[in-house]
């Protein structure tokens, strides 16, 4: 129906428009016209695939209508000029917003041109991470959580761990109609290797310019795991006073130390100084098995040590350990 | 006020051909286009073509191959629709019409009778 | 070329009443359909643009909607000044084409 030979005019918009919930969007539209070509607008209409009706018109002498008058607005089309942008904003964005819109431009005599716009309602999540305090439970259980709060679509987690240990991720409605908050979860069997160290919750999602990392660093209660440290097999009499120390690494932290023999009390050229045992000088040898008992808030273990003072120096004296 | 203000009544043998005007006044001519509509007596609507002031550009109905002509003179603001061999079935009320995408204002309409 | 068939053709109905007259379209137009209202002796006189936008001007008991094929024209209180012919028009695509009429009497 148009003039033979004549180039066409193009409705320009991108194929997919992003909106946050609750805020506004445009949705651009814009009629192209090629260099040569004559073309007069004289309606632009908006419409909703799925809905009855325009929901946006502007006429060449009626102006706008909208089906909603406070949600709608043509941002440039004004009466009296020629009308080549049918941009559309729209406020308040819900979640019922998303879907297929058709913007049109009837011209003349070129007759009517449309292009489909996606419009995406996105709602940016809030993201939390968190230690979930563990003891030794000897099967797996969750030793780390993150939450992305609120998102649209569903955040993508994933975990970043040198531990081992699987994740279990969940969704739910969010607070906001059409939002949903994931879940996961970082599940392992807790060892005391595993306190102290860190994981890593990784949240993608469309609304982020990069993923959000959030690291948590895990906390493993365990009783106390004790060794005792200091004794080299070559203690000699008559060499100067040495000590032995009670290394305990637990979580929480020692209560208290407790030194003995296994023959009962310590004898009198032992002296505790908390997890520390102070050996003084001997003049007869001697064979004593210590005992270190720890205690934490979850309970007591204790390490052995057999010491063994024997006569005659050696030849470099390497016996007990110097203060 | 816009009016669009047509030519009178046309008598026509089959054959010839007939030129109506239609005189607008109210608004800008060269910014909306004109178009030509007609109507059989107790008949319905039938779209013959249009044009714009500005530039001259035409779309016309297919049905009327070639018979139709569709001018316009921006001095007098006045549109003007020729249809040539004319058939006594062409007997029907013309008229103008003002395109907003719709037809917002019409003129008063031309009898045009083509009879042998 | 998109027809455009209505229905009724012809109908009588009361001061006071709501009457309905239907449009369809031979393929989808969007909304981009006109509705007229033409008095005897009168030209056409543009009632709705765009499905469902009345004209300043036309009383508010005419009301359009629809889009596709199916549109509809209510009056929603019949005036005795609403005694005329009414038709549809889709400015889709080239030809613009019209319903054949609905010619309106008031008992």
């Known amino acids: 129906w148009p003039p033979p030979g004549t180039g066409d005019i193009i409705v320009q918009a991108p194929t997919q428009v992003p909106g946050f919930l609750g805020d506004s969007v445009t949705l651009p539209c814009y009629l192209q016209v090629p260099g040569m070509e004559e073309t007069h607008v004289s309606q632009l209409t908006w419409s909703r695939h799925g809905e009855s009706g325009s929901m946006a018109v502007f006429h060449q002498t009626q102006g706008p209508n909208y089906s909603e008058p406070k949600r709608l607005e043509f941002v440039a089309a004004r009466l009296g000029t020629e009308l080549r942008d049918a941009s559309l904003r729209m406020f308040g964005l819900r979640v019922e917003d998303e879907g297929n819109y058709t913007c049109l431009f009837v011209t003349f005599p070129q007759g009517s041109r449309s292009v489909d716009i996606w419009l995406r309602v996105l709602a940016k999540p809030q993201n939390t991470a968190e230690v979930q305090k563990v003891q030794l439970t000897g099967k797996p259980v969750p030793v780390a959580r993150c939450v992305s709060t609120g998102g649209r679509p569903p955040a993508h987690i994933t975990w970043h761990s040198d531990l081992g240990g699987m994740p279990n991720t969940s969704q739910a409605p969010g607070f906001l109609s059409g939002t949903v908050t994931v879940t996961s979860l970082w599940i392992l069997v807790p060892s005391s290797q595993v306190d102290g160290k860190s994981v890593t919750c990784k949240v993608e999602h469309e609304s982020f310019e990069k993923p959000q990392l959030l690291t948590v660093n895990l906390t493993v209660y365990y009783p106390p795991e004790v060794s005792i440290s200091g004794y080299d097999n070559n203690w000699y009499l008559s060499q100067n006073e040495a000590t032995l120390t009670c290394d305990a690494r637990s979580n929480p932290e020692p209560t208290g130390y407790n030194w003995s023999t296994t023959m009962g009390p310590l004898p009198p050229f032992a002296v505790a100084q908390g997890a520390q045992l102070l050996i003084r000088p001997v003049d007869k040898p001697i064979n004593t098995t210590f005992i270190c008992n720890v205690t934490n808030a979850l309970g007591a273990r204790q390490a052995e040590l057999t010491v063994q003072v024997k006569e005659g120096p050696p030849s470099e004296p390497s016996g007990m350990s110097s203060n | 006020e816009v009016q669009l203000v047509q030519s009178g009544s046309e008598l026509k043998k089959p054959g010839a051909s007939v030129k109506v005007s239609c005189k607008t006044s109210?608004?800008?001519?060269?910014?909306?286009?004109m178009h030509w509509v007609r109507q059989p007596h107790g008949k319905g609507l039938e779209w013959i073509g249009g044009?714009?002031?500005?530039?001259?550009?035409?779309s016309y109905n297919q049905r009327f191959k070639g018979r139709v002509t569709i001018t316009v003179d921006k001095s007098t603001s006045t549109a003007y629709m020729e249809l040539s061999s004319l058939r006594s079935e062409d007997t029907a009320v013309y008229y103008c019409?003002?395109?907003?995408?719709?037809?917002?204002?019409w003129g008063q309409g031309t009898l045009v009778t083509v009879s042998s | 070329d998109i027809q455009m068939t209505q229905s009724p053709s012809a109908m009588s109905a009361s001061v006071g009443d709501r009457v309905t007259i239907t449009c369809k379209a031979s393929q989808n137009v969007g909304t981009n359909v006109a509705w007229y209202q033409q008095k005897p002796g009168q030209p056409p006189k543009a009632l709705i643009y765009?499905?469902?936008y009345r004209y300043s001007g036309v009383p508010d008991r005419f009301s359009g909607s629809g889009s596709g094929t199916d549109f509809t024209l209510t009056i929603s209180s019949l005036q005795a000044e609403d005694l005329a012919e009414y038709f549809c028009?889709?400015?889709?695509?080239?030809?613009?084409?019209f319903g054949q009429g609905t010619k309106l009497e008031i008992k």
């Open positions: 044009i714009h002031p500005n530039q001259g550009e035409t």
């Open positions: 019409a003002r395109w907003t995408g719709d037809f917002d204002y």
């Open positions: 765009s499905a469902s």
């Open positions: 109210g608004y800008t001519f060269t910014e909306y286009t």
């Open positions: 028009q889709q400015y889709q695509s080239y030809p613009y084409t």
